[in-house]
């Protein structure tokens, strides 16, 4: 089931998967002077079993002017380039796909791509949030925002961050511990696929994780 | 290119069996998912089911759930669904596409006695 | 399963017009959607995908527009050559559906 909205958004922050749940879909769209080719796909999907998950399809991109070139990035597990855009920071390896069943890590850049990803995300799926550079974080619980399923309806929960502009960069996912209150994080709704195992594994990861590549819009 | 073709149509039986293939050229085969719908005569469309590109990720429609098998052979670039126990109301036109774009001719399958 | 309502299920209309076909789905889908084009006796054509981005290839006649559950596909000034089923079919979600179709006839 796909969220029917974007995650939440917080003044002065940015949100990142740090893995995506099976079924969550990746736009092929490609930079200004460039499109699609009729070869290439038109989304990547996150597939897989109990063991193992990928992304299918290949995204690739072409210029506009000329037809006959196609320039194209096969999705390489091992492969992590630089993506080169303003808003980005610094690129992770991601850890390893295996480390989180039923998930994808994030798909590597293909040539040409446009500037911001747009991912569709599933129920279940985690962000998590990190203060824009000069701004300082606040918890008041977990960085973070889960897409869940109540009453027939997809929302995001509400991540309990505050960044306040202190000249100061904190270190993703937050310098300070996340302080897991009652208050924190309303759950007295009933939530689907998300399961205590999904929270821990990738709240470990999380913390283990160097800054991540940041896009700013998700669809 | 991409280029879809499909065979394996034909008359058969209710009750009988039946499989399609689906060639596939133009494009890296072995990275994308596939699926098969299909179209009776002067009907709409029905998505009938899909396969990830490792085949680790398999869907169905409920109409064919536990008759059709869909699986594909990377290597040798071919999709292919296994059709059995057959009835009337699969008679229909079958094509192989992928991410909707890019469609096979098509291959009939015509369920009778 | 996401049900998609597609209209008119047909339409008689004259070279040069302009005509528009709507596709409803019963949830959101988030522009996920592929508008197609059956020629008789003929395959498929994907026309527009991701709700509005024209296919390479396909003339600017042809566009699409739309949101969370209501999508169309609009062709303007018609041509010979546009005489055709239309589908539309959502890939947001498992198991894909399509629309009925429209038939599109000459006046």
């Known amino acids: 089931e796909l969220c029917d909205d974007d995650p939440p958004e917080i003044p002065h922050a940015t949100f990142k998967a740090m893995a995506y749940k099976e079924g969550t879909m990746l736009n092929c769209e490609c930079k200004r002077g460039f499109r699609r080719i009729k070869s290439g796909s038109l989304y990547m999907l996150c597939t897989g079993n109990s063991s193992h998950s990928s992304w299918d399809n290949q995204c690739q991109c072409t210029s506009s002017a000329t037809r006959n070139t196609t320039k194209q990035v096969t999705p390489q597990p091992e492969e992590q380039k630089e993506r080169k855009t303003t808003e980005m920071q610094s690129p992770m390896q991601p850890v390893d796909q295996a480390s989180l069943p039923g998930h994808c890590r994030e798909p590597p850049p293909w040539e040409n791509e446009a500037t911001e990803r747009i991912y569709h995300f599933v129920v279940g799926q985690m962000v998590y949030y990190q203060c824009v550079q000069g701004y300082r974080a606040l918890h008041r619980g977990p960085a973070e925002s889960v897409c869940k399923m109540t009453h027939g309806k997809t929302r995001w929960t509400q991540p309990q961050l505050i960044c306040t502009g202190e000249m100061e960069t904190s270190q993703f996912p937050g310098e300070e511990k996340p302080q897991a209150s009652p208050e924190g994080r309303p759950e007295s709704e009933t939530s689907c696929l998300v399961t205590t195992t999904d929270f821990q594994i990738q709240t470990e990861m999380a913390a283990t994780m160097e800054t991540s590549i940041f896009t700013t819009e998700y669809q | 290119d991409v280029q879809l073709v499909e065979s394996g149509g034909g008359l058969v039986q209710p009750g009988g069996s039946r499989k399609l293939s689906c060639v596939a050229s133009?494009?890296?085969?072995?990275?994308?998912?596939m699926h098969w719908v299909r179209q009776a005569p002067e009907k709409g469309l029905e998505w009938v089911a899909y396969?990830?590109?490792?085949?680790?990720?398999?869907y169905y429609a409920d109409t064919v759930k536990g008759r059709f098998t869909i699986s594909r052979d990377n290597p040798k670039n071919t999709l292919f669904l296994q059709m059995t126990s057959l009835r009337s109301e699969d008679t229909a036109m079958y094509y192989c596409a992928r991410d909707w774009m890019n469609w096979g001719q098509g291959t009939l399958v015509t369920v009778s006695a | 399963d996401i049900l998609m309502t597609q209209s008119p299920s047909s339409m008689s209309v004259s070279l040069g017009d302009t005509v528009s076909i709507t596709c409803h789905a019963s949830?959101?889908?988030?522009?996920?959607i592929v508008w197609l084009q059956q020629k008789p006796g003929k395959s498929f054509r994907g026309l527009i995908y991701?709700?509005?981005k024209l296919e390479d290839g396909v003339p600017s006649r042809f566009s699409g527009s739309g949101s969370g559950a209501d999508y169309s596909l609009t062709i303007s000034s018609l041509e010979s050559e546009d005489f055709a089923d239309y589908y539309c079919?959502?890939?947001?979600?498992?198991?894909?559906?399509f629309g009925g179709g429209t038939k599109l006839e000459i006046k």
């Open positions: 133009g494009f890296t085969f072995s990275t994308f998912g």
């Open positions: 949830q959101g889908i988030r522009s996920n």
């Open positions: 396969i990830s590109s490792g085949s680790g990720t398999i």
């Open positions: 079919v959502q890939y947001a979600q498992f198991p894909r559906t």
């Open positions: 991701h709700g509005t």
